[in-house]
């Protein structure tokens, strides 16, 4: 996950700023197709965080169709047998083995487009996807470690006198919580759910009279969110003394 964050920081920044985008694609423009096969002989593996409920398009190496013999997509999802989708150009045949998820399909017919689409992305789509293109010159690979991101639900409330609780519920990966101003905070609690999401809870207390409003800032790969709350008075306090 760490690698995914650093390798894709630019893309993640873009996705934060363009929340309206319904699909994600790492596919290359046709103009970028490599004529010289030696440039792409090495296997390429891409770590790719994709937000849940979006559409994702995964691409094969940029090999010209006339050079193709077979295209194979290998899909390895957690706790499931490996699924393969293949297309043989000579016979114009497609074949599937152990593929049960109807949301994972060819973008169109493989003779037109070798890309794979996930429509829409679900939390169960975490896994490894690899396109293998067999040509007379050898096999060309492109692999994707797909990390499905789930936006946490953020809540903030005052549990008791001048103690606030901020929760980032069911996020993937775990969100990070910070406070303005800094308070006297208990260790952050994390609750792991069976589907791979995590609930993070931070509880903090502010003793000083002069703290009026506290802000909980939740940082997450899908975007950041802040909530704030005006604290109740210090118990028993009627009038402020010279506080400042």
């Amino acid at each position: 996950e760490g690698a995914a964050q650093s390798n894709n920081s630019l893309m993640l920044q873009t996705s934060k700023e363009n929340h309206t985008l319904a699909s994600n694609s790492l596919c290359m423009d046709e103009k970028q197709i490599t004529q010289n096969h030696s440039k792409v002989l090495a296997e390429v593996n891409i770590s790719w965080p994709v937000q849940m409920a979006r559409n994702a398009v995964l691409c094969c190496p940029p090999i010209e169709f006339r050079n193709l013999i077979v295209i194979t997509w290998e899909i390895i999802l957690r706790g499931q047998p490996s699924c393969t989708k293949s297309y043989r150009k000579e016979t114009n045949e497609t074949k599937e083995t152990n593929c049960t998820d109807e949301r994972i399909t060819w973008v169109s017919t493989p003779d037109q487009n070798s890309d794979l689409q996930i429509h829409p992305v679900a939390i169960t789509h975490d896994g490894y996807y690899r396109c293998i293109m067999a040509t007379p010159d050898g096999n060309f690979h492109r692999g994707y470690h797909l990390q499905v991101l789930v936006t946490p639900e953020v809540t903030l409330f005052e549990s008791r006198n001048r103690t606030a609780v901020c929760k980032a519920v069911a996020g993937k990966p775990a969100a990070q919580i910070s406070w303005i101003p800094a308070g006297d905070c208990a260790p952050t609690e994390q609750e792991y759910w069976g589907n791979g999401t995590v609930t993070v809870k931070s509880t903090c207390h502010w003793e000083g009279h002069n703290v009026s409003t506290v802000t909980c800032h939740v940082s997450h790969l899908t975007g950041n969110k802040s909530l704030y709350i005006e604290l109740l008075p210090v118990p028993g306090a009627k009038k402020s003394a010279k506080l400042y």
Epitope: I180, V211, S212, T215, S226, Y228, P233
Partner: antibody, heavy 114, light 107 residues
């Protein structure tokens, strides 16, 4: 939707006191801080203090300490701001607000003139 | 007290231009803030809450950014009805403190 209805304009002599009211509706009166802000003619906004009607807890800005009194009447969902020992520089529009500044009254013009 | 330094104090801009106003909190103390618009004879109107959240019904040409001690308010394409005075307000600490205001005039 929160609504804050303030009392009408006042004209006072220097040295007198003024009491401005602000009646709240549309939210749980005892659960939210109520704030007072003033604005002298052609000047910026100045926070005076706040009151928590649920407990009567108050904070006053140091500048007004000793001259300002904020109170709340929970039976009528009304807060009051009384400013004493008035001087000409207290001529201003006085606003009540709540919800960290999301809802404001229309303001009450207090003119201090001899 | 936290002092809020707002700049510029005034500016004259043409319709369609981009406008940027900044607010900085003193003492290096992280705070949260709102941005208000005030027209003559009216109460201030909240435009941006919590530094960057556009209030309901406020046109999308208004935006806010920043965190900690430095904040920016932007009007992407100035409209004639945007002529007003704009204020920031820090509401993290008592006493709450406003910026000095920025008077925005249309050229």
């Amino acid at each position: 939707e929160v609504q804050l209805v303030q009392s009408g304009a006042e004209v006072k002599k220097p040295g007198a006191s003024v009491k401005v009211s602000c009646k709240a509706s549309g939210h749980t009166f005892t659960s939210y801080w109520m704030h007072w802000v003033r604005q002298a003619p052609g000047q910026g906004l100045e926070w005076m203090g706040n009151i928590y009607p649920g407990s009567g807890s108050i904070n006053y800005d140091e500048k007004f300490q000793g001259r300002v009194t904020m109170t709340a009447d929970t039976s009528t969902s009304t807060v009051y701001m009384e400013l004493s020992s008035l001087r000409s520089e207290d001529t201003a529009v006085y606003y009540c607000l709540t919800g960290t500044g999301t809802s404001w009254g229309r303001g009450t013009l207090v003119t201090v003139s001899s | 007290d936290i002092q809020m330094t707002q700049s510029p104090s005034s500016l004259s801009v043409s319709v369609g231009d981009r406008v940027t106003i900044t607010c900085q909190a003193s003492q290096g103390t992280p705070i949260n803030l709102h941005w208000f618009q005030q027209k003559p004879g009216k109460a201030p109107k909240l435009l941006i809450s919590g530094a960057s959240n556009l209030e309901s019904g406020v046109p999308s040409r208004f935006s806010g950014s920043g965190s900690g001690t430095e904040f920016t308010f932007t009007i992407s394409s100035l409209q004639p009805e945007d002529a007003a005075t704009y204020y920031c307000l820090q509401f993290t600490y008592i006493p709450w403190t406003f910026g000095q205001g920025t008077k925005l005039e249309i050229k």
